[in-house]
Amino acid sequence: QAAPFPELCSYTWEAVDTKNNVLYKINICGSVDIVQCGPSSAVCMHDLKTRTYHSVGDSVLRSATRSLLEFNTTVSCDQQGTNHRVQSSIAFLCGKTLGTPEFVTATECVHYFEWRTTAACKKDIFKANKEVPCYVFDEELRKHDLNPLIKLSGAYLVDDSDPDTSLFINVCRDIDTLRDPGSQLRACPPGTAACLVRGHQAFDVGQPRDGLKVVRKDRLVLSYVREEAGKLDFCDGHSPAVTITFVCPSERREGTIPKLTAKSNCRYEIEWITEYACHRDYLESKTCSLSGEQQDVSIDLTPLAQSGGSSYISDGKEYLFYLNVCGETEIQFCNKKQAAVCQVKKSDTSQVKAAGRYHNQTLRYSDGDLTLIYFGGDECSSGFQRMSVINFECNKTAGNDGKGTPVFTGEVDCTYEFTWDTEYACVHHHHHH
């Protein structure tokens, strides 16, 4: 049986049940290669409390559909008197990056995971030439996830004192220049994740090969190498390579630019101080507030919730968007879709789509950007579920009693962007990270 998601095959992936201190290793095409789980384990569970290993999914006992992968085992489990077998179930959803498997829950018999990934899309529009896993768990099983830094189009410029060259990078995947409006970047060779431009010439100085690594707490490393044989004439016989070290800052701060810290014979060392390198719980919340010792800040957007069936309305040319954030109030137009953001076509108001659901909410504060994300909306033709990204700006003089109002700023591939100026986005900092 052919592997259902070949892009995911090259790596062993990790997921964590934080509540129970359990680390899962997952290899969807082969076995995880952990002796304690046996030679054919596709999903190996490491219980760190009891220091035991169990195979909870066998690579030989795999069954697959386009959106579900199940690994059975021969191990019996007793669930309400029935004689079931232990199994793992991975539900796949279309995403814009390779993504990460997320642990959902476990019963006595079934271990459930969810994975939003390009590999599950109906169309190839989000697929990279080359992409590697872009997250890592540290020794305390805290997740560090650089997926939000991945650019689907374009690149980051590395701060470099050399006026004659420009070094462009992407994170964990190659640079896509298809949307380039005609700049230097367009000359970059396909597949490169680190592109050096000198004058009108562009050179591949690194492609992603291995996934993100953690070197020590709050320092993550990504390495790119030039795959192609044939040395570049300005590299003195060496093969180019790029090492990017992502550093979690010691206290809250605005984002910084990736900086070139060393360069010798086409070996480029880059340091990027960014809060995305910090563990995810420091940056994100599933509620509309971020506060406490863990986050070093106090943010509370709950006053933006609308009661009594009213919604914020944002005009989007052909569409109207109805938003009801930070609550579970149904938007009247949205046909009981549990939508936090509802898209209604002006010319035909029966055409209604959920552009993100209130149960699928993430509040993120990172590198000075405050963002509320709603995902899991109605599917687009690519298979990607519509999502909305609301970028908040602090405005102490916002109208509407300080609440302000969301402004639609555009749509890219079924992701709807809004900006929202409000006094409730003014962040209060504590200083003790």
């Epitope: 980051y156 410029l157 220049t177 970047l185 555009g410 962007e417």
Partner: nanobody, 123 residues
Framework: DVQLVESGGGLVQPGGSLRLSCAAS????????WGWFRQAPGKEREFVAA????????SYADSVKGRFTISRDNAKNTIYLQMNSLRPEDTAVYYC????????????????WGQGTLVTVSS
């Protein structure tokens, strides 16, 4: 490629104000970072201001900080440059441009240049 048309230039006295507009055609408007640049006679094209597409984060050349403001109206696919307290040294042709590179002020990282609009500051 994106097509850009700048407007709003003209003759203004020192200390005066102008608002430049840049209309962009193309539905990928909001996938770009946008910049204003200027070129005075006999000089290199220089960075003035930029705005990131995914948020309202802005950056400015030191020479215009506190006097110029870049903004955008995504509904109208338009970028603006509000110029206050104008000085004779602000005289130049002003261009807007698009880039898919984050954190850049380098003109060679921008493309789809418009034809420019002339701003003259003189008494």
């Amino acid at each position: 490629d994106v097509q850009l048309v700048e407007s709003g230039g003209g003759l203004v006295q020192p200390g005066g104000s102008l608002r430049l507009s840049c209309a962009a055609s193309g539905r990928t408007f909001n996938t770009y970072n946008w910049g204003w640049f200027r070129q005075a006679p006999g000089k290199e094209r220089e960075f003035v201001a930029a705005i990131r597409w995914s948020s309202s984060k802005t950056s400015y050349a030191d020479s215009v900080k506190g006097r110029f403001t870049i903004s955008r109206d995504n509904a109208k696919n338009t970028i603006y440059l509000q110029m206050n307290s104008l000085r004779p040294e602000d005289t130049a042709v002003y261009y807007c441009a698009a880039s898919i590179v984050d954190f850049t002020t380098n003109p060679s990282h921008f493309g789809s240049w418009g034809q420019g609009t002339l701003v003259t500051v003189s008494s």
